[in-house]
């Protein structure tokens, strides 16, 4: 996990001192590298990456997605709304990252690293968002039942779910990275 604290980050008068922008940037890129490795194994193991039947599996998922209203795109950018969305989205992805833990053979450690690095990233971002409105945390009971439901799927759906989680998480992180660079 990339370390570092940048004392040059100074908050505007109504903000607390920030955690390092570099640390956040490096952390996201580190996670993206991990996702690439996991996607490689997934795509080599099955033909999910070329499948046109993604919609079937997507019905069972409620993966976080960036929308115009979230304020993270160049059009309609709103830094505070966006930062809340990024943190909320990452918290929502945690259950899906837990699901991925037993889905890899040769990349088991990589899957764990992605999960742990995401937890660290959330902590960095929560420090940056210290004075923003309270961020809602997913309900643990709902997450537990979702995890059970996902694990009970047939093999084909589990493979497709794995592929969709990795693809969606990659897209979410890429959008987050672009937006955070402005902050």
């Amino acid at each position: 996990v990339p370390p570092g604290e940048d004392s040059k980050d100074v908050a505007a008068p109504h903000r607390q001192p920030l955690t390092s922008s570099e640390r956040i940037d490096k952390q996201i890129r580190y996670i993206l590298d991990g996702i690439s490795a996991l996607r490689k194994e997934t795509c080599n193991k099955s033909n999910m990456c070329e499948s046109s039947k993604e919609a079937l599996a997507e019905n069972n998922l409620n993966l976080p997605k960036m929308a115009e209203k979230d304020g993270c795109f160049q059009s309609g950018f709103n830094e505070e709304t966006c930062l809340v969305k990024i943190i909320t989205g990452l918290l929502e992805f945690e259950v899906y990252l837990e699901y991925l833990q037993n889905r890899f053979e040769s990349s088991e450690e990589q899957a764990r690293a992605v999960q742990m690095s995401t937890k660290v990233l959330i902590q960095f971002l929560q420090k940056k968002a210290k004075n923003l409105d309270a961020i809602t945390t997913p309900d643990p009971t709902t997450n537990a039942s979702l995890l059970t439901k996902l694990q009970a799927q047939n093999q084909w759906l589990q493979d497709m779910t794995t592929h969709l989680i990795l693809r969606s998480f990659k897209e979410f992180l890429q959008s987050s990275l672009r937006a955070l660079r402005q902050m």
Epitope: R15, K26, R181
Partner: antibody, heavy 119, light 106 residues
């Protein structure tokens, strides 16, 4: 045409204050972070400060922290650099620059405004 | 802060020459950028994120490198390329610049 126009430079005594303005036109100001970069006469470039698009986060170089304040008026598409306790070594051409969306590059620069600190 | 050292500090070249400017960082950097500045003018972005060509910049300009060592190459020097070139890095704040390389007519 996408452009940034700085103003407010001039001659000021050591210990004095000055406020620089940077007026943006030709693009939607609201999604972009802005920076100030300065260049002492005959010298190289030195980054001074950055402000996030909504003004929530600011970053300063050690040389100006506590003396300079970066602010925005998004309704006027204008950025400001309030410079207090000015020193002779602050003498420079001050450029405002826009940060390329999604990257850290500074892609659009103004023509600069000269600040001279001298008694 | 991260120090950037450019070499050479100045060079003389002819139109059509291949010109290479290097930028060495005191520690590994996250992102490197290259700028061109002409006397009395603002800097102009040429390259961002090590090797991406900025909008409107001719393809004779290219950037390469990673870690601590970076290069700006002008494949065939044109009359309008005589200027001072600066590398700039971002690895958290502050951004820092190299001291500049002046490209003069031989």
């Amino acid at each position: 045409e996408v452009q940034l126009v700085e103003s407010g430079g001039g001659l000021v005594q050591p210990g004095g204050s000055l406020r620089l303005s940077c007026a943006a036109s030709g693009f939607t100001f609201s999604p972009f972070a802005m920076s100030w970069v300065r260049q002492a006469p005959g010298k190289g470039l030195e980054w001074v400060a950055k402000i996030s698009p909504g003004g929530s986060w600011t970053y300063y170089s050690d040389t100006v922290t506590g003396r300079f304040t970066f602010s925005l008026d998004t309704s006027k598409s204008t950025a400001y650099l309030q410079m207090n306790s000015l020193r002779a070594e602050d003498t420079a051409v001050y450029y405002c620059a826009r940060q390329l969306w999604g990257y850290y590059a500074l892609d659009i620069w103004g023509q600069g405004t000269l600040v001279t600190v001298s008694s | 802060d991260i120090q950037l050292t450019q070499s050479p500090s100045s060079l003389s070249a002819s139109v059509g020459d291949r010109v290479t400017i290097t930028c060495s960082a005191s520690i590994s950097v996250s992102y490197m950028f290259w700028y061109q500045q002409k006397p009395g003018k603002a800097p102009k972005l040429l390259i961002y994120d090590m090797s991406n060509l900025a909008s409107g910049v001719p393809s004779r300009f290219s950037g390469s490198g990673s870690g601590t060592d970076f290069t700006l190459t002008i494949s065939s020097l044109q009359p309008e390329d005589f200027a001072t070139y600066y590398c700039m890095q971002w690895s958290g704040y502050p951004y820092t610049f190299g001291q500049g390389t002046k490209v003069e007519i031989k």
